[in-house]
Every structure is written in structure tokens, then in C-alpha cells.
Interface confidence: low
């Protein structure tokens, strides 16, 4: 099962043909952000303007791995950061118990097929409590834009639902529509609740033969934080054919 499929769908991505042209995608990030010492912060990136399929998202700080969200294997949080890093919401990452040492550059690295690798940069400044209150001015409007978009969508949905109910009180809602809404990643992943199918889940002990032992070594590439230049799929088995 593709645990991250829901989140990939939420990016509005679909499988693109093998013969791809120029890389057209862009990564929007939360940009320069500031947060209070001891507090939490959500790192978010959003890949847009491409039909490429996201196969994996890495979160890195300098050359240090924080976490991986793999479309097949789910979440892997680096042991060094397990106590202070939580997966989600979505393909994002939550940093907790911030210290001044957490100040610095963070990178979201989207591995896609057939485009290749997209990298987004976020600069986090961890401030003393009194200073952090003024730090909001550094926020790039992405989160605000996302929130605004959600508000608009919710409003539109409410209006449409209201009108629909008015016109057809006994109308049966489309199952496809409900599923589509769910699979568009409207629900946040919660560590305390079971993951919805298709979301990135914590893969603490991902079995080595996850893709089926009968496929033998052809399945052996179901891993890792490669920079993907090419990717192929065979049944339920995903192949990361490097690189980077």
C-alpha cells in the first residue's frame, strides 16, 4: 500500500509520461520564519506547477537527515531527532522544544518522477520569548495563503452544500466525491490516531522484504533517500533508480 499516496495526491500530482520535457515545478516554502525558544514550528513546502509524481520527501538540516516521507515505506525520523521531530502535518515536519541551536537552514527535497529533484529552503530563527512575538513579520505568506485557500474552499463547499440541500433535500452524496475529498489530504496525520490509508505513517521497523519476497532482488531498491532521476513501477513494487 502506498502510505503517502494521499499526501502525494494532495499535491495535485499525477504520473507523468516517461519522456518529460523541462522541469517546470516550483517549490513554495514558509521562507524565513522565526519561533520562540521552547516552542514548536511547522516546516512546510509545497510543490506546484508540475505533473510529476512525488516519490519521496526528505527533510534535511545542512547535510544532516531529519526525516524521510517515502511513498511506499512511510515516515522515517532520524534517531538523533526522534525526541523533537514529529511527522506532519501532511508532508511537512514539526520541530518541537526549539533551542537557539536549531537556528539555521532547513531543506525539503522532493524526489519526483520524471522531473528529478526539487529543493526548497527554509531559514528558521529561534528567538528568546520576548523577541519572537515580533518575528511574525518574517513569515512568507505561504501559510497564510494556504489558510486563506482553505477558508475559501470551505466557504465554497458550505455554499455549494447549502444550495444543493435546498434544491435536493433527499440527494444522495457521491461516494466518489467524499473519497476524493479525503484523498486530497484534508485530514492531518495525527501520531495518536491511526493513519488514513495513503498517508505517511511512522515506519519504525519497516520490514526488509516489504514489497514481497517472491520478487527477489528486483524489489531490493525499495529504499532510500536517493535523489531520483528515474523511477519505475512494477505492480506494487517501487523502484528508486538513483541518483544524486
Amino acid at each position: 500500500m502506498r502510505w503517502c499516496l494521499l499526501l502525494i495526491w494532495a499535491q495535485g500530482l499525477r504520473q507523468a509520461p516517461l519522456a518529460s520535457g523541462m522541469m517546470t515545478g516550483t517549490i513554495e516554502t514558509t521562507g524565513n520564519i522565526s519561533a520562540e525558544k521552547g516552542g514548536s514550528i511547522i516546516l512546510q513546502c509545497h510543490l506546484s506547477s508540475t505533473t510529476a509524481q512525488v516519490t519521496q520527501v526528505n527533510w534535511e538540516q545542512q547535510d544532516q537527515l531529519l526525516a524521510i516521507c517515502n511513498a511506499d515505506l512511510g515516515w522515517h525520523i532520524s534517531p538523533s531527532f526522534k525526541d523533537r521531530v514529529a511527522p506532519g502535518p501532511g508532508l511537512g515536519l514539526t520541530l518541537q522544544s526549539l533551542t537557539v541551536n536549531d537556528t539555521g537552514e532547513y531543506f525539503c527535497i522532493y524526489h519526483t518522477y520524471p522531473d528529478g529533484t526539487y529543493t526548497g529552503r527554509i531559514f528558521l530563527e529561534v528567538l528568546e520569548s520576548s523577541v519572537a512575538e515580533h518575528g511574525a513579520r518574517f513569515q512568507i505568506p505561504l501559510l497564510g495563503a494556504m489558510a486563506a485557500t482553505l477558508v475559501v474552499i470551505c466557504t465554497a463547499v458550505i455554499v455549494v452544500v447549502a444550495l444543493t440541500r435546498k434544491k435536493k433535500a433527499l440527494r444522495i452524496h457521491s461516494v466518489e466525491g467524499d473519497l476524493r475529498r479525503k484523498s486530497a489530504g484534508q485530514e492531518e496525520w495525527s501520531p495518536s490516531a491511526p493513519s488514513p490509508p495513503g498517508s505517511c505513517v511512522q515506519a519504525e521497523a519497516a520490514p526488509a522484504g516489504l514489497c514481497g519476497e517472491q520478487r527477489g532482488e528486483d524489489c531490493a531498491e525499495l529504499h532510500d533517500y536517493f535523489n531520483v532521476l528515474s523511477y519505475r513501477s512494477l505492480g506494487n513494487c517501487s523502484f528508486f533508480t538513483e541518483t544524486g
Epitope: D63, L73, G116, A208, A220, D224, N227, L229, E242, G244
Partner: antibody
């Protein structure tokens, strides 16, 4: 200090198998892919394959598929490479190395294990 | 497979001068603004040592006299000023596609 400690030189007979180990220390073993490289005498380097210690999955250079088998033991932070059906062509120095995170560059290397296949 | 051709196969450079080593790939190893070409130094009896990763990033602990440049298919390693301890064989390696391959090596001799 980050270290990759490999087993000493091996002298084996043609047709036999050998298991080379690479003990990692000084870093989080499961965070970094381990790669293996062959260097024949006086020649360049060849990538054999790599294994992800966390997920346990490996990938091979097609040239070495069937010749090399890569495994890891997370509890002892050790990577292993088994070479089978050995011939004189397999005589070489074999290195394990740690793959960087942001790209497949190899930032720390073992000292190398010299394998001699001779009757 | 991507073939990496290094040139020259060997060169002799006077102490304090510049050494330039070229590596040409049979296919582009660059994407999304990154070039997946790396450089190593190897001395006899020792394992290779990473000098430069992703074309131009200096590995920590490596002297600043080493620098890398290039994108697409053409890459260069520069050493300036050359020092006695730089006598070694230098290899380029790509990770632009599987299998990862190395160049044939360039042997640097100090005059």
C-alpha cells in the same frame, strides 16, 4: 570520530566464497546508506552496490548482481558483503564507504580489504 | 551507463602552480540546479578521500586550495597552489544515474 573498520586481507581458493565486514562507529548507522566499491590492482574504482541499514534493502550494479550479496546487522552496526564463486578476476581491494545524505558522494571510507583468489 | 573520461591521465605540476583536471561525462549529470559530480583523492595504500561533492562543494577539512566547477557534462578540479602532499591519483565520480561510475583517474606528480 566516524570510522569504518574492515576485516583484514583474505586469501581464498577459486570457487569459494568470502564474507567481508565493515564495522561502523561514530554516527547513526541507520541514517546513512553503506556502499561497496571494488578496486582492481592499478585500476579505477567500481561501485558494487549499496544497502540501506534502516530499511534493509539493497541495490546492485548489474555487473555484480549474483556475485555480491549485501547485508547489515543493525545491532552491531556492521555491514557485510559476501562474494561467491570466486575467480582470479575477483582479486582486488574492496572498500565500504558511507554515502552522503544530499547526494551519492562517499564521505567516509573503510581502509579496504585485500582479497586474493588463488589456488 | 554514464562513462566518465578524465584528462589528462597524468600530469606533472611545479610546486605552487595550478593543477587542472578535467572530467567529461557521456551524459548530463545535472538536474534541478544541482550537478551530481564528486571528486576524490587517493594515495597509494589508502582509501579514496572525498574532496568535492556536487561539483563545487568543498568537503569539511579539505584545504581551500581545492576547488571544483562545471555543470552538465564538463567538470573541472583545480588545485592551486599545488603542495607536495597533493601528489596522488584523483578520481571523478557521478551519481546522476545508476550505476554510479568513476573516471579512470588522473595521476598528479609534483615537480
Amino acid at each position: 570520530e566516524i570510522q569504518l573498520q574492515q576485516t583484514g586481507p583474505e586469501l581464498v581458493k577459486p570457487g569459494a566464497s568470502v564474507n567481508i565486514s565493515c564495522k561502523a562507529s561514530g554516527y547513526s548507522f541507520t541514517d546513512y546508506i553503506m556502499i561497496w566499491v571494488k578496486q582492481s590492482h592499478g585500476k579505477s574504482l567500481e561501485w558494487i552496490g549499496n544497502i540501506h541499514p534502516y530499511f534493509g534493502n539493497s541495490h546492485y550494479n548489474l555487473k555484480f548482481k549474483g556475485k555480491a550479496t549485501l547485508t547489515v546487522d543493525k545491532s552491531s552496526t556492521t555491514a557485510y558483503m559476501q562474494l561467491n564463486s570466486l575467480t582470479s578476476e575477483d582479486s582486488a581491494v574492496y572498500y565500504c564507504a558511507r554515502r552522503g545524505i544530499t547526494s551519492a558522494h562517499f564521505d567516509y571510507w573503510g581502509q579496504g580489504t585485500t582479497l586474493t583468489v588463488s589456488s | 551507463d554514464i562513462v566518465l573520461t578524465q584528462s589528462p591521465a597524468s600530469l606533472a605540476v611545479s610546486l605552487g602552480q595550478r593543477a587542472t583536471i578535467s572530467c567529461r561525462a557521456s551524459k548530463s549529470v545535472s538536474t534541478s540546479g544541482y550537478s551530481y559530480m564528486h571528486w576524490y583523492q587517493q594515495k597509494p595504500g589508502q582509501p579514496p578521500k572525498l574532496l568535492i561533492y556536487r561539483a563545487s562543494n568543498l568537503e569539511s577539512g579539505v584545504p581551500a586550495r581545492f576547488s571544483g566547477s562545471g555543470s552538465g557534462t564538463d567538470f573541472t578540479l583545480n588545485i592551486h597552489p599545488v603542495e607536495e602532499e597533493d601528489a596522488a591519483t584523483y578520481y571523478c565520480q557521478h551519481s546522476g544515474d545508476l550505476p554510479w561510475t568513476f573516471g579512470g583517474g588522473t595521476k598528479l606528480e609534483i615537480k
